[in-house]
Each structure stands twice: as C-alpha cells, then as structure tokens.
C-alpha cells in the first residue's frame, strides 16, 4: 500500500505516457489520476511499467472501480492483467470475445493460470454455453482446455461447437469426458460421408459404444492401432475376431505388439483361441477349444 | 537465459565520477530497450535511465545532465557515466531490459558516495 502523499509540483500527470516509467510508486499514486488512467488504459500496455509501478495502477483503478472494472478498461489491461487475482477477475462481466482474446494473449505461452481459469469461467456463463467462435479462441491458446472441463460442463458444448475441435485438443481427456463428447461429435458430422466421417469422429471414439465400432468395421476404415487402443475397453471386449481385423485393416498386425496392454489382452481373453489364430499373428491366451462360454451377464439379465 | 552482468560500482567522494557497466547475453541485445534502476538503502526502486534500440536516451529529473546512458552492441554493453556524483546518487544500481518489468533484483552493483 502506498503512503499517501502530495503530488510534487510539476510532476501531475497530463496523460499516460513514458514518462512515467521515471515515477516512482508514490509518484504514480500522488500524480496519475485515475479517471485519466481508465481512459487511457490501451497506452498502459505499451509502456514498461516494473510490475511493482502496475500494482500501484491497479490499485488506483481499484478505487475508481469498486464494485469491478467496466469491460471498455477490461479489453486494455494488458500486462496489468497479470496483476488481477481471481477474487478481482469474478467481479468483471466480459461479453466480448476480443476483450477474452486480448487478456488470453498477454498469457501466452504459459500454463493456464487461476486468472485465466476464472476469466473463462465468467465468459462462458455469461454466454450460457460454449459456442464455437468461444470454443475456437480457448482451444487456439490452450489445447488441452476442452480436457480440463468437467463432464457435466461438457455437457452445455452444443455439437456445432464439436467442428472447432482439433485432434491435439482431446489428448488429456479421459474416458468419462470422451464419453459426453462422442455422441456430440456423431451428430456434428453425420451428414458426412465414410472416409471423411472417419477421418473426424477418429479423435473421438474413446468415448464410442460397441455398436458403433461394430458399424465402423464395415466401412474399411484401417483404424491405426494408438485409436484403437484409445478405445473403451467394455466397447471392444464384445467385438469378434472378424470384426476387429476389418476395423484395423492393414494394421491389424499391431495387435501382437500390444497384446499385454488394455483393451487388447482384456479382448484377447474373451477370444476363442481358434478365431485369433486365424490372424497368423501368434496371440496367446484366448479361450481353448472345446470350452463353452457362459455368459453370465446374459444369464442374470434373464432371470 | 537471460544474463546481465553489472560492473563499475565503488566508494568515491561527492562531485566525483563512475562509469557503470552492464554485459547481456541470452538475448537479441541490438532489439531490445535497456535501463538502469537503482534503489537505495530504506528507498524503493527508482529507474534512472532508458536506452531504446534506436538509440535514444531518457533520464530521471534527479540525474538530468549528469548521468549519461550508451550502450555498445558489438559488446552487448550497456553503460551509465555518472560525473557529478551526489551521495543521495548512493544505492544499488542494476540493469535491465526494459520489457522483462523487473526493476530491482538481483545482484547490481553497489555505488557509495561520501561527502
């Protein structure tokens, strides 16, 4: 907190310039109004102020701005930004996009911060859901963003949103986020055909149900094995031997460089050893000839 | 890294002269705008002088037509000439580029005027 004190003659603002970078932190608290720094916040950016001289703006706007800054000095803050704590952040009610990108731009490049966390928090429930211009510019400046919202807040992306999505968006996400996200992406890209559907909804599958990887194997769609192993476990597990050397095509012969690893070993198992050995690939472990399977899922649900 | 070296300081007597120097690395030193800070004892940091990449200098009003800021880029230096030296110009001087928004840190080097 700076000691208040008079303003040396001579010394009082006229506007924010570069001659400020000279003042020091008393200076700026006796001589910058804060009414003139509001207005002319867009120049503050472009002036090295140290981080301690912009504490001092900050809390001169502070002031000025109680009740939370109006979004005409939100769009301007620039590096100021980097001075505002989440508490400041969800007093502020920021519809713009361009004001969410000018404030994403100055934390380019580093992790996401808990400003940047709330900024985004408050724009996406100002806006009531993530729309894809929105969905666009938090992607572009943190890939793995779509990956840090919960299930339940994935649920409020509409499919249309699904279009903006980039395969490197999806790689942190985990099978219950994949879950909420799939049947989304199916809808948004269903009018397209075969290859090019595949080529979309791919990032995607770890969240699809059997049925749909049952259908994709009759499409010749040559899964590469890192999808394939991606995909849900209980979803694969009731795939046959056919339908999975149709799935992968060519690559099917990965299969024996995986065949320790989920969902490959667990599939391997319900396998009769018959079936896998007409891949010539030398998988072990499936069901011997001559033993009958008893499904006993099956024979609860009947009961 | 980011590496600036200061050098130069020392105890003389008031009206007295330094020249304080100022080595970079680990960064473009002809595109970038440099400046000296200084914080004396008991004081806050204070900037004293800029030197942009065009060449042109600006100064606090307190060492205005004493202190002289250069900078040599075939050297990566950046130097402060201070003549006429005040023992209220005592204090720590480090320097900076001007877009890192540090001020005061680190080690500087260390000018004692007495009277």
């Known amino acids: 907190e700076v000691e208040k004190t008079a303003c040396p003659s001579g010394k009082k603002a006229r506007e924010i310039d570069e001659s400020l970078i000279f003042y020091k932190k008393w200076e700026l608290e006796a001589c910058v109004d804060a009414a003139l720094l509001a207005t002319q916040m867009d120049r503050v950016n472009a002036i090295p102020f140290t981080y301690e001289q912009l504490d001092v703006l900050k809390h001169k706007l502070d002031e000025l701005y109680p009740q939370g800054y109006p979004e005409s000095v939100i769009q301007h803050l620039g590096y100021l930004f980097l001075k505002m704590s989440p508490e400041d952040i969800r007093k502020w009610n920021v519809t713009s996009l361009e004001t969410l990108k000018a404030l994403l731009e100055v934390n380019k490049g580093h992790e996401m911060s808990p400003q940047v966390a709330t900024l985004i928090d408050r724009f996406v429930k100002g806006r009531g859901q993530l729309d894809k211009d929105t969905l666009d510019t938090l992607t572009a400046f943190y890939p793995g963003y779509l990956c840090s919202l919960s299930p339940e807040e994935l649920s409020s992306v509409p499919p249309s949103s699904i279009w903006a999505v980039r395969p490197q968006d999806l790689d942190t996400c985990d099978p219950r986020q994949l879950d909420v996200l799939y049947p989304k992406a199916r809808l948004a890209f269903q009018n397209m055909n075969g290859s090019e559907y595949f080529v979309k909804i791919q990032s995607f599958l770890g969240g699809a149900p059997t049925e749909d990887l049952k259908a994709l194997s009759q499409q010749n769609v040559s899964m590469d094995l890192a999808t394939f192993m991606k995909l849900r476990t209980d979803a694969v597990l009731p795939l046959t031997v056919a339908e999975v050397q149709k799935l992968l095509g060519p690559h099917v012969e990965g299969l024996k460089a995986e065949e320790r690893h989920r969902p490959v070993r667990d599939w391997i198992l319900r396998q009769r050893q018959d079936d896998l050995d007409t891949l010539g690939l030398g998988l072990q472990g499936g069901i011997p000839n001559g033993y009958l399977v008893l499904d006993l899922s099956m024979q609860e649900a009947l009961s | 890294e980011v590496q600036l070296v200061e050098s130069g300081g020392g105890s003389v007597q008031a009206g007295e002269t330094l020249r304080l120097s100022c080595t970079a690395s680990?960064?473009?030193?002809?595109?970038?705008?440099m400046g000296w800070y200084r914080q004396a004892p008991g004081d806050e940091c204070e900037l004293v002088s800029t030197i942009s990449s065009d060449g042109s200098t600006n100064y606090a009003d307190s060492v205005k037509g004493r202190f002289t800021i250069s900078q040599d880029n075939a050297k990566n230096t950046v130097y402060l000439q201070m003549t006429s030296l005040k023992p209220e110009d005592t204090a720590i001087y480090s320097c900076?580029?001007?877009?890192?928004?540090?001020?005061?840190w680190g080690q500087g080097t260390l000018v004692t005027i007495s009277s």
């Open positions: 900076r580029t001007m877009a890192s928004r540090i001020g005061c």
């Open positions: 680990g960064f473009t030193f002809d595109d970038s705008d």
